[in-house]
Interface confidence: low
């Protein structure tokens, strides 16, 4: 049977097949894919900017940062305000102080410990 390069199309992931000769073809890949048949998802993570222990998760023509709990934002560079998230983080009248990557308690009246409970 006669070989027709683009019938059926060898291009995957939405790539468009173009016949370049009697027995040759090329695939025009959608953004985010590469390879002779668009078989490879381009790794968008090599140039990532995930900070503070964020993990880069490759997507199709994009990436996302999976942030640890105490950080947020596109690149995990924004400090989560634990004092807002945990209104009762400090006991016995202690004052919650937000810090980069965490929080601390300023204790009063002789109380001590991480949460002023001692």
């Amino acid at each position: 049977s006669l070989y027709v390069p683009c019938a059926p199309s060898p291009c995957v992931n939405g790539g468009t097949c173009r016949q370049t000769g009697d027995f040759t073809f090329e695939c025009n890949c959608l953004p985010g894919f590469e390879g002779s048949t668009c078989e490879r998802n381009i790794d968008d993570c090599p140039n990532h900017r995930c900070q503070n222990g964020g993990v880069c998760v490759d997507g199709v023509n994009t990436y996302n940062c999976r942030c640890p709990p105490q950080w947020t934002g596109q690149f995990c560079t924004e400090d989560v305000d634990e004092c807002l998230l945990q209104p009762n983080a400090c006991q016995n009248g202690g004052t919650c102080a937000n810090r980069n990557g965490g929080y601390g308690c300023v204790c009063v009246n002789g109380w001590s410990g991480d949460d002023c409970s001692e």
Epitope: P31, N47, R49, Q51, N52, G53, T62, Y63
Partner: antibody, heavy 117, light 112 residues
């Protein structure tokens, strides 16, 4: 205060090895990518490569691949750029810079490397 | 690699005057995450480059409001509204949307 302090100027002969350093302080060292940027005399800066201190993972500009290595010692919050065999064309100012906001937010003072016979 | 072209190469200015520096990229700098990673730096004589503007128009901490950035896609501009002596030096644009990060060739701002 965030600070990156680099080692002093070096004069070397072609073929010699060299390791220059960049000590970070005033922030959590492991949390931020450290870049190395080359600036040849009278030219603009060129991004060379980076290291992720937390994991030790590196990424290089293809143009510089195989010419130098980047390493880190987390215990002393220091990143390194190292050559095993210097060439005259390695003569340049080398800057380390801390990542942030998708850019280079803080820079070291630079280390001038001169390679001459 | 993305080519970053800055104009002019040299810019003679009067103190108190206004400055406009152009930076063009060989391809769009809009990242698939929606951000545009185009930044501006100043390198004063004998010093390290310092970040002025990140992601087109955001002033870095401590940068005076006489510096402003604008633009989109492939065309970007840095403006200095009232030039002061400490503004003299070489200005560079940098793109970090596409790997590898690439700098423009620089614009030297000097006294007329």
């Amino acid at each position: 205060e965030v600070q990156l302090v680099q080692s002093g100027a070096e004069v070397k002969k072609p073929g010699e090895s060299l390791k220059i350093s960049c000590k970070g302080s005033g922030y959590t060292f492991s949390n931020y990518v450290i870049h190395w940027v080359r600036q040849m005399p009278g030219k603009g800066p060129e991004w060379t490569g980076y290291i992720i201190p937390g994991s030790g993972g590196t990424k290089f500009n293809e143009k510089f691949k195989g010419q130098a290595t980047i390493s880190v010692d987390k215990s002393i919050t220091t990143a390194y750029l190292q050559w095993s065999s210097l060439k005259a064309s390695d003569t340049a100012m080398y800057y380390c810079a801390r990542d942030g906001a998708g850019s280079f937010t803080y820079w070291g003072q630079g280390t001038l490397v001169t390679v001459s016979s | 690699d993305v080519l970053m072209t800055q104009t002019p190469v040299s810019l003679p200015v009067s103190l108190g005057g206004q400055v406009s520096i152009s930076c063009r990229s060989s391809q769009s700098l809009v990242h698939s995450d929606g951000n545009t990673y185009l930044h501006w730096f100043l390198q004063k004589p004998g010093q390290s480059p310092q970040l002025l503007i990140y992601r087109i128009s955001n002033r870095f901490s401590g940068v005076p409001d006489r510096f402003s950035g604008s633009g989109s896609g492939t065309d970007f501009t840095l403006k200095i509204s009232r030039v002061e002596p400490e503004d003299l030096g070489v200005y560079y644009c940098l793109q970090s949307t596409h790997f590898p990060d690439t700098f423009g060739g620089g614009t030297k701002v000097e006294i007329k």
